[in-house]
Interface confidence: low
Amino acid sequence: GALEVQVPEDPVVALVGTDATLCCSFSPEPGFSLAQLNLIWQLTDTKQLVHSFAEGQDQGSAYANRTALFPDLLAQGNASLRLQRVRVADEGSFTCFVSIRDFGSAAVSLQVAAPYSKPSMTLEPNKDLRPGDTVTITCSSYQGYPEAEVFWQDGQGVPLTGNVTTSQMANEQGLFDVHSILRVVLGANGTYSCLVRNPVLQQDAHSSVTITPQRSPTGAVEVQVPEDPVVALVGTDATLRCSFSPEPGFSLAQLNLIWQLTDTKQLVHSFTEGRDQGSAYANRTALFPDLLAQGNASLRLQRVRVADEGSFTCFVSIRDFGSAAVSLQVAAPYSKPSMTLEPNKDLRPGDTVTITCSSYRGYPEAEVFWQDGQGVPLTGNVTTSQMANEQGLFDVHSVLRVVLGANGTYSCLVRNPVLQQDAHGSVTITGQPMTFPPEA
């Protein structure tokens, strides 16, 4: 039969500094021995030799001594190349050329990537800001690859596209530092977010800055809360921020503060007649008494539960009054999925197997994605169920039915849509008669 050389169609994505495997396989004929094998790995464009195997032995690396074959696997037709300590300069196409009696070759692409750091934000000018002032916000993120895509948005998530200047500079290692500058005219207050996206890793690095300009005293009470929901993990404490603008000469004796559930109007906590009236909500709330006089009416909610999720209203009454609602979004991370296989022994190509992916005690409901070893989504024959326990936390069970090929890796990704937390599990099934899990 004709010699077939196979490589992955999709680029191999490797992080800078890690090791990458450039997969290549060929179909050895019966009676094949390594003495017959001639294998060359070379750079596709320049034809520079990278690694070779000839005359029955590994001829070694011709590429900075950072490559290796898998000698124990060559006889089975596995000509894959291990590239160590990947650098930006390694990016490109590598050709695997196999010559026995017949010959064949195929090229595999290496896509190098490096995650961007969490952006740092600077403000110029950074003090005595008033509405109407023009400020320059700089967002800087470092040591990523390839070039980033930078997005700015305001507190409502509305894109800010005007007056943005982004520059990207590569260092000696080829990694990029990105600096993006946004010029804005301040409103009454505002949150400005910068998102630096690595388009290969689909990794987003976020930072934001909230600017509250000083105001001229007007006598009106202005109550301010974050525009975005407060996200809190189950079992942790959450701060529902609320602030108001006290007039000169303000004293706590004048303050009437009520926190209540926005929908039911159930009282949560109050401060009246110059003192904290305490929690009316399962004794799990507290104010920040030392900060009230400065206009900080924030509420601490302890040991957050799923049932706490919703909108809380902060109502401030002095001579004037005002209120604002803040949303609490409760979340709990999903556990690393456990994978089970049915049937789980004596598996052969063509068998239909049921792979179950189970992840526990998350909130809110998960999104489940399956994919094969090449990262191609598997959307058919998937059944996902989610059940809430007494605490409102979800256990997710996703079942994939698949017909086995010669071998295959099946990955399950359980995403918490609020935390943007991904929990992964995978199972690799080889085409030889096998048992799962593998026996020792």
Partner: antibody, heavy 118, light 106 residues
Framework: EVQLVESGGDLVKPGGSLKLSCAAS????????MSWVRQTPDKRLEWVAT????????YYPDSMKGRFTISRDNAKNTLYLQMSSLQSEDTAIYYC???????????WGQGTTLTVSS | QIVLTQSPAIMSASPGEKVTMTCSAS?????MSWYKQKPGSSPRLLIY???NLASGVPVRFSGSGSGTSYSLTISRMEAEDAATYYC?????????FGGGTKLEIK
């Protein structure tokens, strides 16, 4: 104010080629991904192509690969779509749209019409 | 590719009436966006990332959903809301649109 103005639509014979342009203003063009989306005579919307802010990453649906080429000139704030081997099924209004994070199309041009007919 | 099915294909509502239209995906998607198109005009973004209101869109519009089931709601129908509404998924390439729901005023 964000403005996207497409041009270049025309009547073309089957097998012919055409290049569409989209002039952008009112935002920092070089910071945003851009896309082409078309609307067929039966009013269905179809994504045609996407290009990242720096032009490094380009995506097409399989049905358009090889025949359509998206490109951009950030110095000129202009997006392009080169089309070849045109067929009657390519008859549509072609819209250029700014593409936020490759998630959604936040601003659209007024469209330019391509008719493929003998 | 992910197929989006919008229902109903055509509907009508009286001014002040609550309107809900749905978009069903053939497999789970991460985000859904919604666009409004009036005859002779280009589409306009209404809702992004499933539930966020685009700039300048009236608060009577809202979006919700997850997994394979999404909806667009108009709390009180107004004459200017008569248009065709399209959903669009972001989860996997190719990005796809629904076939549209035509909303008419009674």
């Amino acid at each position: 104010e964000v403005q996207l103005v497409e041009s270049g639509g025309d009547l073309v014979k089957p097998g012919g080629s055409l290049k569409l342009s989209c002039a952008a203003s009112g935002f920092t063009f070089s910071s945003y991904g851009m896309s082409w989306v078309r609307q067929t005579p039966d009013k269905r919307l179809e994504w045609v192509a996407t290009i990242s802010s720096g032009g490094s990453y380009i995506y097409y649906p399989d049905s358009m690969k090889g025949r359509f080429t998206i490109s951009r000139d950030n110095a000129k704030n202009t997006l392009y779509l080169q089309m070849s081997s045109l067929q009657s099924e390519d008859t549509a209004i072609y819209y250029c749209a700014s593409d936020y994070g490759s998630r959604y199309f936040d601003y659209w041009g007024q469209g330019t019409t391509l008719t493929v007919s003998s | 590719q992910i197929v989006l099915t919008q229902s109903p294909a055509i509907m009508s509502a009286s001014p002040g009436e609550k309107v809900t239209m749905t978009c069903s995906a053939s497999s789970s998607v991460i985000y859904m966006s919604w666009y409004k198109q009036k005859p002779g005009s280009s589409p306009r973004l209404l809702i992004y990332d499933t539930s966020n209101l685009a700039s300048g869109v009236p608060v009577r519009f809202s979006g919700s959903g997850s997994g394979t089931s999404y909806s667009l709601t108009i709390s009180r129908m107004e004459a200017e809301d008569a248009a065709t509404y399209y959903c669009q998924q972001w989860s996997s390439y190719p990005r796809t649109f629904g076939g549209g729901t035509k909303l008419e005023i009674k």
